[in-house]
């Protein structure tokens, strides 16, 4: 059904990391725009991004509103310059997204090492603790508040002279590692929700070596 | 140091909301850790209700988690347990506890190691 | 859930005497999240051991934990009066955080 001048989105696939969160779809629009809903299983339907000539639409304000929540949404299509016009049922053509829960579902941003620091055969490395888009109280939480104990960290280190790794964890953002006098070392961290059954892993964060500016080193 | 401090009604009629409160003392709330509910039946063992974070980041038992409501209140220092459609089964002591972070094997991980004194809730016509 | 399976569930013995208390679980456990608690009676939990293997502050040398995967050890080397009570491991790497049943250790 639908007009002959419109076609049905499809392709819809959700893209998230830490909660920023873009609905994409095809094709490019050709004499057509789009409208997108938005709602949770037991919520009303909220229209976002109205006709737009876009292929995403960016529906982060509405589910950092409860990011445990699951979330659908619909694509609409309209003749362009016509948007009134509906399909032969009376309906214009939509197509439905697969259902996304942020907290389960959302990728894992790249963590960074915020810092280290040797004290003596002892390094802590401490991980920041990335802001999201999620408000509690009118301030923006930490991937920490969100995740809670759900969250862990991974870190690799090893000798910049060698390259057998070692991995310790951590249920915080920081690390107390024991490490050989006078060795310089690398460090490299992962995000890791252990729970999960799907991206259950972020990327490796940028490698980050002892004797390079970002640590600081103590000889006691 | 920090002490915990459970209150509440002791007495609590079938299908109503048990409604308790842990104070926190010789602590900030937002200082990091994570607080947990725990009950103990008469005469058995332990089993955790569930924890909050001071941001509200909260896990709960799957078996209770249809009746459970943990809260946080930052500006009082307190947490809180609702558990909704009680019945003569939610009789216990009922106990509040820090879950602080302990260095292990190149981490820090939470183990609770401060406890409320425990709160005895019946729950009977 | 994972099950822990604490045996025996009475330990008779006498002041002086060695007591080794075990926890079975019933899937892997990582290490780092395994607890001992000593409870007495009218009291709330205490933490005796942390990670498997670490004595939480302020508990004596004479109380030690070992143990990995499935099978966990707590060991008092010798018991002092004040030790008569129960003991309960705790997971809490996998939600529901759970408790073993406890093994109540009793002068003979």
């Known amino acids: 059904s639908g007009t002959t001048n419109t076609v049905a989105a499809y392709n819809l696939t959700w893209k998230s990391t830490n909660f920023k969160t873009i609905l994409e779809w095809e094709p490019k629009p050709v004499n057509q725009v789009y409208t997108v809903q938005i709602s949770t299983k037991s919520g009303d339907w909220k229209s976002k991004c109205f006709y737009t000539t876009d292929t995403e639409c960016d529906l982060t304000d509405e589910i950092v509103k409860d990011v445990k929540q699951t979330y659908l949404a619909r694509v609409f299509s309209y003749p362009a310059g016509n948007v009134e016009s509906t399909g032969s049922a009376g309906e214009p053509l939509y197509e439905n997204s697969p259902e996304f829960t942020p907290y389960l579902e959302t990728n894992l941003g790249q963590p960074t090492i915020q810092s280290f620091e040797q004290v003596g055969t002892k390094v802590n490395v401490t991980v920041e603790d990335e802001r999201t888009l999620v408000r509690r109280n009118n301030t923006f939480l930490s991937l920490r508040d969100v995740f809670g104990k759900d969250l862990i960290y991974t870190l690799y280190y090893w000798k910049s002279s060698s390259s057998g790794k070692k991995t310790a964890k951590t249920n915080t953002n920081e690390f107390l590692i024991d490490v050989d006098k006078g060795e310089n070392y690398c460090f490299s961290v992962q995000a890791v929700i252990p729970s999960r059954t799907v991206n259950r892993k972020s990327t490796d964060s940028p490698v980050e070596c002892m004797g390079q500016e970002k640590g600081e080193f103590r000889e006691i | 140091q920090v002490q915990l401090q459970e209150s509440g009604p002791g007495l609590v009629k079938p299908s109503q909301t048990l409604s308790l409160t842990c104070t926190v003392s010789?602590?900030?709330?937002?200082?990091?850790?994570?607080w947990s509910w725990i009950r103990q039946h008469p005469g058995k063992g332990l089993e955790w209700i569930g924890e909050i974070y001071y941001s509200g980041s909260t896990r709960y038992n799957p078996s209770l988690k249809s009746r459970v409501t943990i809260s946080v209140d930052t500006s009082k220092n307190q947490f809180s347990l609702k558990l909704s459609s009680v019945t003569a089964a939610d009789t216990a002591v009922y106990y509040c506890?820090?879950?602080?972070?302990?260095?292990?094997?190149?981490?820090?991980?939470?183990?609770?190691?401060?406890w409320g004194k425990g709160t005895t809730v019946t729950v009977s016509s | 859930e994972i099950v822990l399976t604490q045996s025996p569930g009475t330990l008779s013995l006498s002041p002086g005497e060695r007591a080794t208390l075990s926890c079975r679980a019933s899937?892997?456990?990582?290490?780092?999240?395994l607890a001992w608690y000593q409870q007495k009676p009218g009291q709330a939990p205490r933490l005796l051991i942390y990670g498997a293997d670490s004595r939480a502050t302020g508990i004596p040398d004479r109380f030690s934990g070992s143990g990995s995967g499935t099978d966990f050890t707590l060991t008092i080397s010798r018991l002092e009066p004040e030790d008569f009570a129960v003991y309960y491991c705790q997971q809490d790497g996998v939600v529901p955080y759970t408790f073993g049943g406890g093994t109540k250790v009793e002068i003979k």
């Open positions: 899937e892997s456990v990582d290490s780092s999240y």
């Open positions: 010789g602590g900030s709330i937002s200082s990091g850790q994570y």
């Open positions: 506890a820090r879950d602080a972070p302990y260095y292990y094997g190149g981490g820090y991980y939470y183990y609770m190691d401060v």
